[in-house]
């Protein structure tokens, strides 16, 4: 990737990622420097007849760093702080080629939950107020609520009225997704409204 347009690479928290390096064809490489946010990560001197010299200069990421045979950077056990700008400089006798990358760390979504604050009106209509959440949600998580294939809400919250006298059994499903994972959780309107009805009759007695 040229330095003008960094290659955006997605990594998953806790997993591994490779930043691919392309070599100038037919040129002898003198050394390669890898940088993270403009700080040196590693300095590599290739040898034709023996193993390359690899000097890891960033102790923080050092134990999680590896290099492929073509000196692409492999980073394992990814952490959120690995997010940022990476650059590789390949120096030959005649030129220096720069490759740029932007690494984005995404979380696998975990622990989807639905909370319910519902009301029963005197006409026996049940108004459902549902809120969907996942652990450590960020701005890259999309939420939506669906029923019978229709999207009823594009937010973590759903407000909907359900009348047991005219509506058949109805499931509402929250779907949370990001670029690397998706989770869903379904709730039954009938069950939720029955629970509210029990509470309602208990308080009336």
């Amino acid at each position: 990737q040229s330095s003008l347009t960094p290659l955006m690479v997605n990594g998953i928290l806790g997993e591994s990622v490779t930043l691919p390096l392309e070599f100038p064809a037919g040129e002898k490489v003198n050394f390669i420097t890898w940088l993270f946010n403009e700080t040196s990560l590693a300095f590599i001197v290739p040898h034709e007849t023996k193993s390359p010299e690899i000097h890891v200069t960033n102790p923080k990421q050092g134990k999680r760093l590896n290099f492929t045979q073509s000196y692409s950077l492999q980073l394992s056990n990814l952490k959120m702080e690995d997010t940022g700008s990476y650059r590789a400089q390949i120096s030959t006798k005649t030129s220096a080629k720069l490759s740029s990358y932007t690494l984005r760390i995404l979380r696998q979504l975990r622990n989807i939950q639905v909370t319910n604050h519902s009301q029963l009106f005197q006409n026996m209509t049940c108004e459902l107020h549902l809120t969907c959440s996942v652990e450590d949600a960020d701005d890259n998580v999309s939420f939506r609520w669906e029923a019978l294939g229709n999207t009823l809400s594009s937010q973590p919250n759903l407000t909907v009225s359900w009348d047991p006298r005219i509506s058949s059994e109805q499931d509402y499903t929250c779907i949370a997704e990001n670029a690397v994972s998706n989770l869903s959780f379904s709730v039954s309107a009938q069950k939720l409204c029955e629970d509210v009805k029990i509470q309602y009759t208990d308080t009336k007695m």
Partner: antibody, heavy 118, light 106 residues
Framework: QIQLVQSGSELKKPGASVKVSCKAS????????MNWVRQAPGQDLEWMGW????????RYADDFKGRFVFSLDKSVNTAYLQISSLKAEDTAVYYC???????????WGQGTTVTVSS | QIVLSQSPATLSLSPGERATMSCRAS?????MHWYQQKPGQAPRPWIY???NLASGVPARFSGSGSGTDYTLTISSLEPEDFAVYYC?????????FGGGTKVEIK
């Protein structure tokens, strides 16, 4: 039917403020996020950010932090975009657009032209 | 942010011809949405989640792709298809649009 109706064109002087409205009808307003999109003359579409119509919490794209404010009046199913300290480069058509999920904008307002000129 | 590059910038074709336009993302995205815009009008939803046609969109339109490469195809151009088509990604904030492909009459 489902629609978003925006307020009319505005001509403003640099440094002034403007408030664009977007009135929703035909659906439960608080169930769908409202996005704002800018299109400068002859330019591409730029996503400005969105507001959660249930909680009222806005989220702004980096280029639109500071002078741009999203707000709601849930009692009249209306979203607002306010721009302060207007500059000539704010001259554009501003669209509101409903998010149907996965940030797919299935319903758009007709657009409000804001012209900033001295 | 994820940059979406659309190509070609302009497609000059005649009615009845096949149109294919590309949208390339600077990073892998899960799905792509497409919108049609005509001069002086708001964009209209056209294709959502890569391959699903929006309500009222004719079957001559199709969408495909995955990862970083997505395509919108019009099998046989009709006069009303001449417009600008924008792709848009949702996988990462900020949501970004491509620069558009203008389909014009040759």
């Amino acid at each position: 039917q489902i629609q978003l109706v925006q307020s009319g064109s505005e001509l403003k002087k640099p440094g002034a403020s403007v408030k664009v409205s977007c009135k929703a009808s035909g659906y439960t307003f608080t169930n769908y996020g409202m996005n704002w999109v800018r299109q400068a003359p002859g330019q591409d579409l730029e996503w400005m950010g969105w507001i959660n119509t249930y909680s009222g919490e806005p989220r702004y794209a980096d280029d639109f932090k500071g002078r741009f404010v999203f707000s709601l009046d849930k009692s009249v199913n209306t979203a607002y975009l306010q721009i302060s300290s207007l500059k000539a480069e704010d001259t554009a058509v501003y669209y509101c657009a409903r998010d149907y999920g996965r940030w797919y904008f299935d319903v758009w307002g007709q657009g409000t032209t804001v012209t900033v000129s001295s | 942010q994820i940059v979406l590059s659309q190509s070609p910038a302009t497609l000059s074709l005649s009615p009845g011809e096949r149109a294919t336009m590309s949208c390339r993302a600077s990073s892998s995205v899960s799905h792509m949405h497409w919108y049609q815009q005509k001069p002086g009008q708001a964009p209209r939803p056209w294709i959502y989640a890569t391959s699903n046609l929006a309500s009222g969109v004719p079957a001559r339109f199709s969408g495909s792709g995955s990862g970083t490469d997505y395509t919108l195809t019009i099998s046989s151009l009709e006069p009303e298809d001449f417009a600008v088509y924008y792709c848009q990604q949702w996988s990462s904030t900020p949501r970004t649009f491509g620069g558009g492909t203008k389909v014009e009459i040759k």
